[in-house]
């Protein structure tokens, strides 16, 4: 049993990060076997933290391969029956000791998760899990607390409405105080610590114990058959059946005698006292969230999980917040639906990640009658009189640019501006000079032009202005219609997409 850098992972790391002494704690969490996201749901079957943790102090050049681990067992009490299939989560926490602002610092070094099958009362199961550069070797087993017995820790207590109602000779049942303890069904004298029964008058032994009442440790039990124990660690003195007779090791394990007992050297993929426990295979479905299990078609080979988008971890048990990677461009809103990622795009952008900058003014709203103008790979708003700013939302002073020529006075008006011209000038912007003899009116610039008939000239100017205005209005109408069509198209698509999102979120 160890926790340290895995093989071939470079220079062994210290868990203390060269910051003085630290301690390792292990948090064990058990969840029902069907738990979807093993790190996100509650430890419904129970949880426990290791105690009696030795302090680890890093010394220069010292290998971190063998770290001092917590002494003894981590016991995880569980309620009710033992499910047999469960999710085992083991977290390795580091407590940095010494002077730190705010007291000791805690860090999660590693978390391993796996789906397991295990009958209560069985032998220790061994396992090795790797996460990142760390490797954890551990063993686990499930044991029933009396009066629960059997592979599923079935209760042997009879239901009663209250402890006070328990019949003669019966006590309240533990750990189920609302029930009464049933009369003993095991063989009289059967060890309550090392034996259990599933049928009346039987005494089955837990791993490591033997004898009719499960009171004899396995280390001396092989001498019961016409042998007597010899001095310490010399085995048995009289001939008789040996502990390896009949090969108690299953699945091709090889047996060797040790201290009057036996030890099985198990082939890869098997473990347990008699190599009776096999490893998890892909057929067991160890990968959460639909992950693809690769390898592990037999217990000799370790499995690897290939996770769907949005999940990670050795068993695809951790959900990734994919929106934290900000996949939606151009200010799009990110929605992680679990099985899919959706981007709700701002006006003017489209595509699964809002990556397409719409190639016209369809998504660009220019306020207050402004028109959208393209050019040079960008778009801008050409604002109506009296408005300015990027989207024509700001009120502008039409007189700020001094539009009235030749000293004309500017007056702001709700529909634009009016120029009061100085004597000798006329026109919308006072741009025409009036001859003193009243013969003709000439545009102030260019000065070379002269008109014989001022009336005809003015009519021509007005006609030109009218044509230009009509052209501008027609252009605006065309732009508005095309923009409305495009907006309707994208709104329709967006409404459909939002409906999809709503359905998917509800699902």
């Amino acid at each position: 049993h160890s926790f340290g850098p895995g093989p071939g992972l470079g220079t062994p790391r210290s868990p203390c990060n060269a910051r003085g002494p630290c301690r390792l704690f292990f948090r064990v969490c058990l969840k029902p076997g069907v738990s979807q996201e093993a790190t996100e749901s509650l430890c419904a079957l129970g949880a426990a933290l290791s105690t009696s943790v030795p302090v680890y102090t890093e010394h220069p050049g010292e290998s971190a391969a063998a770290l001092p681990l917590p002494d003894g067992l981590v016991r995880v009490p569980f309620r009710d029956a033992w499910p047999g299939t469960f999710s085992l989560v083991i977290e390795t926490w580091r407590e940095q000791l010494g002077e730190h602002a705010g007291g000791p610092a805690w860090n999660l070094l590693a978390r391993v998760v796996g789906r397991r099958r295990l009958a209560a009362g069985g032998p220790w199961a061994r396992d090795v899990q790797r996460t990142g550069t760390w490797e954890l070797h551990f063993s686990y087993r499930a044991r029933c607390e009396p009066p629960a017995v059997g592979a599923a820790c079935a209760r042997l207590c009879r239901s009663r409405s209250a402890p006070s109602r328990c019949g003669p000779g019966l006590r309240p049942c533990t750990p189920f105080p609302d029930e009464c303890e049933a009369p003993s069904v095991c063989r009289p004298g059967c060890s309550p610590e090392h034996g259990y029964c599933e049928e009346p008058d039987e005494c089955r032994c837990l791993e490591g114990w033997t004898g009719p009442l499960c009171t004899v440790p396995v280390s001396t039990s092989s001498c019961l058959n016409s042998r007597v124990p010899g001095p310490a660690s010399t085995g048995c003195l009289l001939p008789g059946p040996g502990p390896c007779d009949g090969n108690p090791c299953a699945n091709g394990g090889s047996c060797s005698e040790t201290s009057g007992s036996f030890e099985c050297a198990c082939p890869r993929g098997f473990y347990g006292l008699r190599c009776e426990v096999s490893g998890v295979t892909c057929a067991d479905g160890p990968c959460f969230n639909g992950g693809l299990c690769v390898g592990g078609e037999d217990p000799d080979s370790a499995y690897v999980c290939h996770c769907p988008p949005g999940f990670q971890g050795s068993n695809c048990e951790k959900r990734v917040d994919r929106c934290s990677l900000q996949p939606c461009q151009n200010g799009g809103l990110c929605l992680d639906l679990g099985h899919a990622l959706r981007c709700r795009c701002r006006a003017g952008f489209a595509g699964p990640r809002c990556e397409h900058d719409l190639d016209d003014c369809a998504g660009r709203a220019c306020a207050n009658g402004g028109t959208c103008v393209e050019g040079g790979g960008s778009r801008r708003c050409s604002c109506a009189l009296g408005f300015g700013g990027r989207d024509c939302r700001e009120r502008a002073d039409p007189c700020a640019s001094r539009p009235c020529a030749h000293g004309g006075r500017c007056y702001a008006h709700f529909s634009g501006l009016v120029c009061a011209c100085a004597p000798g000038y006329m026109g919308v912007r006072c741009e025409f000079a009036v001859r003193p003899d009243g013969a003709d009116a000439v545009p102030a610039a260019p000065r070379g032009l002269r008109q014989a008939d001022p009336q005809r000239f003015l009519a021509g100017v007005i006609a030109v202005i009218v044509v230009v205005v009509i052209a501008i209005v027609a252009g605006i109408v065309v732009l508005v219609i095309s923009r409305k069509k495009r907006m309707a198209k994208y709104e329709k698509a967006e409404i459909k997409e939002m409906g999809e999102m709503h359905r998917e979120l509800n699902a």
Partner: antibody, heavy 117, light 107 residues
């Protein structure tokens, strides 16, 4: 050995109903997402729908083309997933496969559904 | 839905030759592309996952490459049992979608 065996296919008139079954063996069925994928004659593969685990409240997802007409359910105690097909159309004619997981790793041999008048 | 376009539709080759099949996605799918093989009268079989990883039990002559929108399945030296229809599938965005298939036939 992992095996998925589909059944329940046959000839049905447009507007009719059919229920397909897929029985799994060799896997811990309750730990696997299950999908239905179909293949029209001479055509490519089309995902039909998916059912997830008990821990996901048996969440289901469907292709747009079958939404509201097809229903997927599962019975973990029987290692079986079902596809209930209602209001069948001629374009639903295909071989229907059940597959596992998100990546369709294990496949059944398929069952043929023919919708014709 | 993401559209996958496979080319060519048919590939006529002799045993021992190298086969190169193409799959183009309508948008970025990262490396979430799988390749499936389907022989006449049989169900599809997963060959490659994650664009370039061989699935359990798949011979080394099959290899996949690509990321983003362009993906390739290569069969380095065609064996008689490799003549079949090959489909690419994307698993980046739900729902999963498949290409139209490429038929590898004996010349």
């Amino acid at each position: 050995e992992v095996q998925l065996v589909e059944s329940g296919g046959g000839l049905v008139k447009p507007g009719g109903s059919l229920r397909l079954s897929c029985v799994a063996s060799g896997i811990t069925f309750s730990n696997f997402w299950m999908n239905w994928v179909r293949q029209a004659p001479g055509k490519g593969l089309e995902w039909v729908g998916q059912i997830r685990l008990k821990s996901d409240d048996y969440a289901t997802h469907y292709a747009e083309s079958v939404k509201g007409r097809f229903t997927i359910s599962r019975e973990d105690s029987k290692n079986t997933v079902y596809l209930q097909m209602n209001s069948l159309k001629t374009e639903d004619t295909a071989v229907y496969y059940c597959t596992t997981g998100y990546y369709f790793d294990y496949w059944g041999q398929g069952t043929t559904v023919t919708v014709s008048s | 839905n993401i559209v996958l376009t496979q080319s060519p539709a048919t590939l006529s080759l002799s045993p021992g030759e190298r086969a190169t099949l193409s799959c183009k996605a309508s948008e970025n799918v990262g490396t979430y592309v799988s390749w499936f093989q389907q022989k006449p009268g049989q169900s599809p079989r997963l060959l490659i996952y994650g664009a370039s990883n061989r699935y359990t039990g798949i011979p080394a002559r099959f290899s996949g490459s690509g990321s983003g929108t362009d993906f390739t399945l290569t069969i380095s030296s065609l064996e008689p049992e490799d003549f079949a229809v090959y489909y690419c599938g994307q698993f980046y965005s739900f729902p999963s979608t498949f290409g139209g298939g490429t038929k590898v036939e004996i010349k």
